[in-house]
């Protein structure tokens, strides 16, 4: 029963992680540049995402624009986009496998096959988690590097956006969920032995009598 609870918890965490990756992918807040000038016309915040950028004026107006082409996206965000999309697809596969291998589903009859499927699902979630943590951490590294680079103009210095924190949370959930599912060991195939043992015992008992 404890194994069942662990499995449900693992799946739940991984699914939450998968949803968080989608949110991280969709939110246009990977990098944030704020210009707080002496003047409200030029005081604005620029959000950069994987799909669009947004300009938020100090007056509260927000204008978002989808990137015209893939080339409009900086190289690090191009790579991040690719990895995050792959991560979403991989995590979706993990969800599918975890449903198939779930103790409370009847997709597979064999308990051993179910357990193995669940371990594969766990590994898949771990992979998805790694695929998220890499671009998120790389983007954060670049932002921090530029922030302390004296050659980068202060107006060009970006800050870490909410998407990066969501991304770290997502990878944490996927890694944790995947780890719990990998702990789901397959049952030992000792049924034949126990059957032989009980047969031997009953035979011995009848001889004694």
């Amino acid at each position: 029963m404890a194994s069942m609870g662990l499995q449900v918890m693992g799946i739940a965490l991984a699914v939450l992680g998968w949803l968080a990756v989608m949110l991280c992918c969709a939110l246009p807040m990977w990098r944030v540049t704020a210009f707080i000038g002496s003047n409200i016309v030029t005081s604005q915040t620029i959000w950069e995402g994987l799909w669009m950028n947004c300009v938020v004026q100090s007056t509260g107006q927000m204008q978002c624009k989808v990137y015209d082409s893939l080339l409009a996206l900086p190289q690090d965000l191009q790579a991040a986009r690719a990895l995050v999309i792959i991560s979403i697809i991989v995590a979706a596969l993990g969800v599918l496998l975890s449903v198939v291998g779930g103790k409370c589903t009847n997709c597979l009859e064999d308990e051993s096959a179910k357990a193995k499927t669940m371990i594969v699902a766990g590994v898949v979630f771990l992979l998805a988690g790694l695929m998220v943590i890499v671009p998120v951490s790389w983007t954060a590294h670049n932002i921090i590097q530029d922030f302390y680079n004296p050659l980068v103009a202060s107006g060009q210095k970006r800050e870490m956006g909410a998407s990066l924190y969501v991304g770290w949370a997502a990878s944490g959930l996927l890694l944790l969920g995947g780890g719990l599912l990998c702990c789901n060991c397959p049952p030992r195939t000792d049924k034949p032995y126990s059957a032989k043992y009980s047969a031997a015992r009953s035979a011995a008992a009848s001889n004694y009598v």
Partner: antibody
Framework: EVQLVESGGGLVQPKGSLKLSCAAS????????MSWVRQAPGKGLDLVAD??????????YYADSVKDRFTISRDDSQSMVYLQMDNLKTEDTALYYC??????????WGQGVMVTVSS | DIVLTQSPALAVSPGQRATISCRAS??????????MNWYQQKPGQQPKLLIY???NLDSGIPTRFSGSGSGTDFTLTIDPVQADDIATYYC?????????FGSGTKLEIK
């Protein structure tokens, strides 16, 4: 539709004072920053001053050429913007426009009011 | 301050394409966001916002108007030009304080 109507312009002597008013309608005045932009005869446009909305603490900005001489203010209850101009100089002669701030620019403009500084 | 340079005048025949340029003394773009606006001022009238963020048409502006460019070079295109388009066109940046305007390009019809 955004409507801005300026008033208070006229002829004034150097070192004199004048107060321009701008009545706004057709939009949620409380949510927008407002500004005064001027255009000297036959010349281009120059931002004179701007003021943010209440949510941004009514922050103000003044062009270097008018600092300590001009004061921008607003009255949200009346949807009015004002420009108090003191110690006027001949180079302040221009058409003064009241403009609403939008997208890092000026989205709605009044017809303008002429200010002539001459002895 | 960022200086915006525009050519003083441009003469175009009706039905033709008019291309008005604006060059900034330094980049007015950040992270593929182009902080440049365009205005039209007809004789004796107040200016009117045409395009914001270099390429976004303000509401109610005909699709004959379009904007492009990034970094330091920006273009306002009117295609096709109509007699009603006689005006002075100004560019304005919001990259840093103070926001400045170009000197304006007067569009004349041949």
């Amino acid at each position: 539709e955004v409507q801005l109507v300026e008033s208070g312009g006229g002829l004034v002597q150097p070192k004199g004072s004048l107060k321009l008013s701008c009545a706004a309608s057709g939009f949620d005045f409380n949510s927008y920053g407002m500004s005064w932009v001027r255009q000297a005869p036959g010349k281009g446009l120059d931002l004179v001053a701007d003021i943010s909305s209440k949510s941004y603490s009514y922050a103000t900005y003044y062009a270097d050429s008018v600092k300590d001489r001009f004061t921008i203010s607003r009255d949200d209850s009346q949807s009015m913007v004002y420009l108090q101009m003191d110690n006027l100089k001949t180079e302040d002669t221009a058409l003064y426009y009241c403009a609403m701030i939008l997208y890092g620019g000026f989205g709605g403009w009044g017809q303008g009011v002429m200010v002539t500084v001459s002895s | 301050d960022i200086v915006l340079t525009q050519s003083p005048a441009l003469a175009v025949s009706p039905g033709q394409r008019a291309t008005i340029s604006c060059r900034a003394s330094q980049s007015v773009s950040i992270s593929s966001v182009n902080l440049m606006n365009w205005y039209q001022q007809k004789p004796g009238q107040q200016p009117k916002l045409l395009i914001y963020h270099a390429s976004n048409l303000d509401s109610g502006i005909p699709t004959r108007f379009s904007g492009s460019g990034s970094g330091t070079d920006f273009t306002l295109t009117i295609d096709p030009v109509q007699a009603d388009d006689i005006a002075t066109y100004y560019c304005q940046h919001s990259r840093e304080s103070p926001p400045t305007f170009g000197s304006g390009t007067k569009l004349e019809i041949k």
